[in-house]
Structures are given as structure tokens and as C-alpha cells.
């Protein structure tokens, strides 16, 4: 058993049929010695008396909020949560496996630049009685500070018969140098509690590997006189690290016909313009990627060829 | 039929071309190592991230763009006098060129060159003959060092009398290649910045 936060405790249980469970001793936080009784949750049934209560925790029915009273007055609470371990593996029932970039990916994180700011998100089908708490650090043995905000519900989607909920959190490394060469990864730890079930999820990464620039901005077409050609131009996104001559981007330019069957025409370039022949009903798209370290491409910025 | 590869026009910062070749070569070599050594811990997640230049050179700090010098987190051990030798500088004088920047890059390259050559000598003794260092990568390191044109004592190749442990050597190769790729990215950023200055 260990303390998650004040008056909230996690009991780690090997989860198999007829498992012996875990013996837990609760102590009432009071100077009083006599006349103390214990109850569980809303029940008025007295479970025991005295300053301590010993219980055998085997299943969710044994978890919950234990309260010690004296003469009708509440003295203190202890909330017991269960963390299940099945076949030596901690349960992952609360969050959905996103399977990207590999199986057992429950947390996904992205950064728009090298400032040390990043966003992580996760998915669940659970809609109520759910809380998350996020901690992060750079390295684990001698951790350096990363500050995370509160996790918030950021999107709801319907997937077949199920509703899916996306939660996200923003974190900022306390003292980040955009030009630094990372040797210790960022560690992100999410505590998830659904009713009386506790689970924890972790992710470890270098900022350089989770970079995904915003799409190029101000994508514009300028017709060239006396020809079918147009000059396509774009700019670095505002959120990208500066100076741009140091943190350079490379771009992928694509011309796509209206029909998805038509072959896409694409090139890569370090420039912020290209000459394009505009076909009727075609669209021109541009996306960005760090020029020197191949992390994710941005989403496409697109403009119709009208 | 291949023409001789075009060199950048004389007005262009001469080392940019070489640094781009360096990043390409080390990235290709790392990819080859990951594939060839698929049953060894050779991915970014599996290896320990070591920097053989740590406490010996200060490339990141010395080559910091002017715009980042206001960032307290970037100013660990900053030197501020200016570089004056080295052919990559051509005739440009810019406050970005602090002492240590290009000479620090040169020292990085020299250290990695020695490590890679020593390692290659060991790998050539491996009866499995599983992996060797790409000669192109070694040549590109040499070209960039020549373009930087710093006079520096030659470091003798390390020789070892004991029987090499080929498993450890291959893991060390992965660690070195990962670290060198990260440094090659920094070098490319620096050269790009200098070229734009």
C-alpha cells in the first residue's frame, strides 16, 4: 500500500481467482483513543472499533472510503483504491491503446517546436467518475523540472456504437534551451482513477522525436503573366522555433487532382515558393518538417487551384 | 554517367555543403546499423545516450545563434571572444562567430574520427564480418575537417592489446552513431545559420 495523495491510498493486488489479497491496517487521524468506530462509504454498518482497523483487501468491494467516527462526529477519512496486477502485468483498462506508433501506446505526445513545451493526449471510452493527474520530469534518476497543467477533456468522438473521449495536457520544461542536444528523455506519468480503480501510464521521449510543426502559413497563389503557371508561396508557421536559419524546415509540395484516383505530383524543397501548373479542380498542398532531423510532418496547408 | 558533383558557388559558406553530406552519411550509416544489428540494442529507445565530446568541447554553447544568447537556459558555459581562423569563415565577420564554434566542431569531428577508425579496426577482426563503417562517412568527416582547416595535433589511433569483445563493440558503434547523428544535426544547423548571416 502507498499514499497517492493525502488520505488516498493505493493497494496493489495480484489479481487471480482466490488470491489472498493484501492485509491493510488503517489508523484514525485523531488524538482520541476510545469510542472510535469505522464505516465504509455511505453504509452505517460498523466494521470495527478502535483507533486502528485491520482489513483484508481482495476485491473492489473492499475498496472505498473508510471513515472513523466518534459520537456521530467524523474524525478522518482514508480512500482505498485498487491497482490490479494480472499475470505480472499492471492493468490498462481505463485508457485505450492508440496502437500508433506501436502497440501498447496509451499516451501520445507532440511538440510544435524546440521550446520545451509539449502536449500529450490519451483516449478513453469512460465518461464519468474519472480523474487524471499528470507529472513529468527530464530524466528519472536526477530529475529536472517539467511543469504540467491539469488534464482536460479536449474532444469527444463517436466510434461505431461507442463514444470516445480525448483528454490532453500541456507541459513545459522549466529551463529549456531550444538548441540543446538532449541526452536524457522527458518522462511523463499519468495517474488515472476510475471509481475505485487506479492505473498509471508512462511515456518516455526526446523532444526532438515528437516534433510536429504547425502547417505552413499564408499559402498563396500568384498567377504568372502569359502562362498557365502560378507562383505558390508560403511561410514558416508562427509557432516554429527561431531563428529560422538555424531551425530550418523542409517542405513537401503536392498537386492533387479532384479525383483521388489521379496520381499525386509531389516534390520536396527547402524553398518557400515553387512554380506550379494549375489544373482545373486541382488543389495545391504544402507541409513542413524539420530540415535536419526527420520527425513528423506537419498537417497539410491547402489551397484550391481556382 | 555522373558529372563531378557541383560545389556550392564561391559566395556560399563553404562548409554548408560538406555538413549536409555529413548528416546524410551518418544517417545512412545509422540506418544500416539498425537494420544489420536488429538483434542488438541499437534503437534510440534501447541505447544509453553518451556524448564522447562531453566536457571536452562545447559546440552547442559556442555555436549558439545570437538570438538565443538572451535565453538563460542556453548560457551554461558561454565563451564570447570571436573566431578568426579557419577557412570556412571566408571574409565574414559576424558576432555569431565566437571562439570555439568552428574549432569546437573541428575537435568533435577529430574525436569521432579517431573513435570510428579504432572501432572499424576491431570490426574488421570480427569473424562474423557483420558490419563495418561506411568509408564514405569517414571520407565526408575528413572533407569537412579539411574545409574547416584548423591546425591541430593529430590524435593517434587508439590501439588495444586485449581481444575485442565484438558484441560490446557493436553496441558501442550504435551509441556512437546515435550521438554523432545528433551532433551532425547541430553542425548542419550552425552551418545553415552562418550561411544566412
Amino acid at each position: 500500500i502507498w499514499e497517492l495523495k493525502k488520505d488516498v491510498y493505493v493497494v496493489e493486488l495480484d489479481w487471480y481467482p482466490d488470491a489472498p489479497g493484501e492485509m491493510v491496517v488503517l489508523t484514525c487521524d485523531t488524538p482520541e483513543e476510545d469510542g472510535i468506530t469505522w464505516t465504509l462509504d455511505q453504509s452505517s454498518e460498523v466494521l470495527g472499533s478502535g483507533k486502528t482497523l485491520t482489513i483484508q483487501v481482495k476485491e473492489f468491494g473492499d475498496a472505498g472510503q473508510y471513515t472513523c467516527h466518534k459520537g456521530g462526529e467524523v474524525l478522518s477519512h482514508s480512500l482505498l483504491l485498487l491497482h490490479k496486477k494480472e499475470d505480472g502485468i499492471w492493468s490498462t483498462d481505463i485508457l485505450k491503446d492508440q496502437k500508433e506508433p506501436k502497440n501498447k501506446t496509451f499516451l501520445r505526445c507532440e511538440a510544435k517546436n524546440y521550446s520545451g513545451r509539449f502536449t500529450c493526449w490519451w483516449l478513453t471510452t469512460i465518461s464519468t467518475d474519472l480523474t487524471f493527474s499528470v507529472k513529468s520530469s527530464r530524466g528519472s534518476s536526477d530529475p529536472q523540472g517539467v511543469t504540467c497543467g491539469a488534464a482536460t477533456l479536449s474532444a469527444e468522438r463517436v466510434r461505431g456504437d461507442n463514444k470516445e473521449y480525448e483528454y490532453s495536457v500541456e507541459c513545459q520544461e522549466d529551463s529549456a534551451c531550444p538548441a540543446a542536444e538532449e541526452s536524457l528523455p522527458i518522462e511523463v506519468m499519468v495517474d488515472a482513477v476510475h471509481k475505485l480503480k487506479y492505473e498509471n501510464y508512462t511515456s518516455s521521449f526526446f523532444i526532438r522525436d515528437i516534433i510536429k510543426p504547425d502547417p505552413p502559413k499564408n499559402l498563396q497563389l500568384k498567377p504568372l503573366k502569359n502562362s498557365r503557371q502560378v507562383e505558390v508561396s508560403w511561410e514558416y508557421p508562427d509557432t516554429w522555433s527561431t531563428p529560422h536559419s538555424y531551425f530550418s524546415l523542409t517542405f513537401c509540395v503536392q498537386v492533387q487532382g479532384k479525383s483521388k484516383r489521379e496520381k499525386k505530383d509531389r516534390v520536396f524543397t527547402d524553398k518557400t515558393s515553387a512554380t506550379v501548373i494549375c489544373r482545373k479542380n486541382a488543389s495545391i498542398s504544402v507541409r513542413a518538417q524539420d530540415r535536419y532531423y526527420s520527425s513528423s510532418w506537419s498537417e497539410w496547408a491547402s489551397v484550391p487551384c481556382s | 554517367r555522373n558529372l563531378p558533383v557541383a560545389t556550392p558557388d564561391p559566395g556560399m559558406f563553404p562548409c554548408l555543403h560538406h555538413s549536409q553530406n555529413l548528416l546524410r552519411a551518418v544517417s545512412n550509416m545509422l540506418q544500416k546499423a539498425r537494420q544489420t544489428l536488429e538483434f542488438y540494442p541499437c534503437t534510440s529507445e534501447e541505447i544509453d545516450h553518451e556524448d564522447i565530446t562531453k566536457d571536452k568541447t562545447s559546440t552547442v554553447e559556442a555555436c549558439l545563434p545570437l538570438e538565443l544568447t538572451k535565453n538563460e537556459s542556453c548560457l551554461n558555459s558561454r565563451e564570447t571572444s570571436f573566431i578568426t581562423n579557419g577557412s570556412c569563415l571566408a571574409s565574414r565577420k559576424t558576432s555569431f562567430m565566437m571562439a570555439l564554434c568552428l574549432s569546437s566542431i573541428y575537435e568533435d569531428l577529430k574525436m569521432y574520427q579517431v573513435e570510428f577508425k579504432t572501432m572499424n579496426a576491431k570490426l574488421l577482426m570480427d569473424p562474423k564480418r557483420q558490419i563495418f563503417l561506411d568509408q564514405n562517412m569517414l571520407a565526408v568527416i575528413d572533407e569537412l575537417m579539411q574545409a574547416l582547416n584548423f591546425n591541430s595535433e593529430t590524435v593517434p589511433q587508439k590501439s588495444s592489446l586485449e581481444e575485442p569483445d565484438f558484441y560490446k563493440t557493436k553496441i558501442k558503434l550504435c551509441i556512437l552513431l546515435h550521438a554523432f547523428r545528433i551532433r551532425a544535426v547541430t553542425i548542419d544547423r550552425v552551418m545553415s545559420y552562418l550561411n544566412a548571416s
Epitope: 503557371q229 523542409t250 509540395v253 498537386v255 496520381k263 499525386k264 505530383d265 509531389r266 516534390v267 520536396f268 524543397t269 527547402d270 524553398k271 515553387a274 512554380t275 506550379v276 501548373i277 489544373r279 486541382a282 | 554517367r1 555522373n2 558529372l3 558533383v5 557541383a6 546524410r24 545512412n28 540506418q31
Partner: nanobody
Framework: EVQLVESGGGLVQAGGSLRLSCSAS????????VGWFRQAPGKERELVAA????????HYIDSVKGRFTISRDNAKNTVYLQMNGLKPEDTAVYYC????????????????????WGQGTQVTVSS
Amino acid sequence: EVQLVESGGGLVQAGGSLRLSCSASGRSLNDYIVGWFRQAPGKERELVAAISSGGYIQHYIDSVKGRFTISRDNAKNTVYLQMNGLKPEDTAVYYCAANQLNGVARKKIESDDYDYWGQGTQVTVSS
């Protein structure tokens, strides 16, 4: 292996026009970016224009923008460089080169590092 042959060069007066052709044999050019380079005596070789595999995206150096047009006919396995308003400074040997689009290196359209090269055709612009 792609073999490239340039044609269409010659002597022309300033202000005149020429159309260079680059024909490929040995393999289809459909999956290749194709570029036209030039090298004047005593000068560096430079990329003049390049065209994407589908022909819809192009790159030109500033000095030829609005005067030169690169195009391709994939059915004929040929790439063209239409040169109008020629100037004496356009005098050079013009080379055609091809770069495989889906190579691991993911080469840029403005790159000067091409896989296959032709022998070149001389263009001379007299004043």
C-alpha cells in the same frame, strides 16, 4: 539505368529562342525529377530549372524566371527546356539530369546532386 541524350542546342542571337530536348532510354522517366543544368567556361555548374515527375511542379533560378519554361511529355519519355529572350550570359553547355523521386535520400527539387546525367549540348548566344 537511364541514358539521357540532349539535343536542340546551337548558336542564336540575343533575344532569340531555342528549345532543348532531353530524351531518355533504358527506363521510363515517369518516376524521376528531371533538371536542366548549365556550365559556362570557368564557372560553377548551376541548376537552371527542374520539373516534378508529373510535370505540375517546377523550380527555376531567378535569372531565367519568366524567360525559360521546363515541360515534359511522359508518353515520349522526353523533357524540354523552352528558352526565350536569350541573353549572352545564357551561353553554356546545358546538361539534362534525372533523380529518382522515391529514393531514401528524398532529394529536393533544387538539389544539385542528381543520379543520371546526359553528355550536354552547347548553347551560344551572340550579341
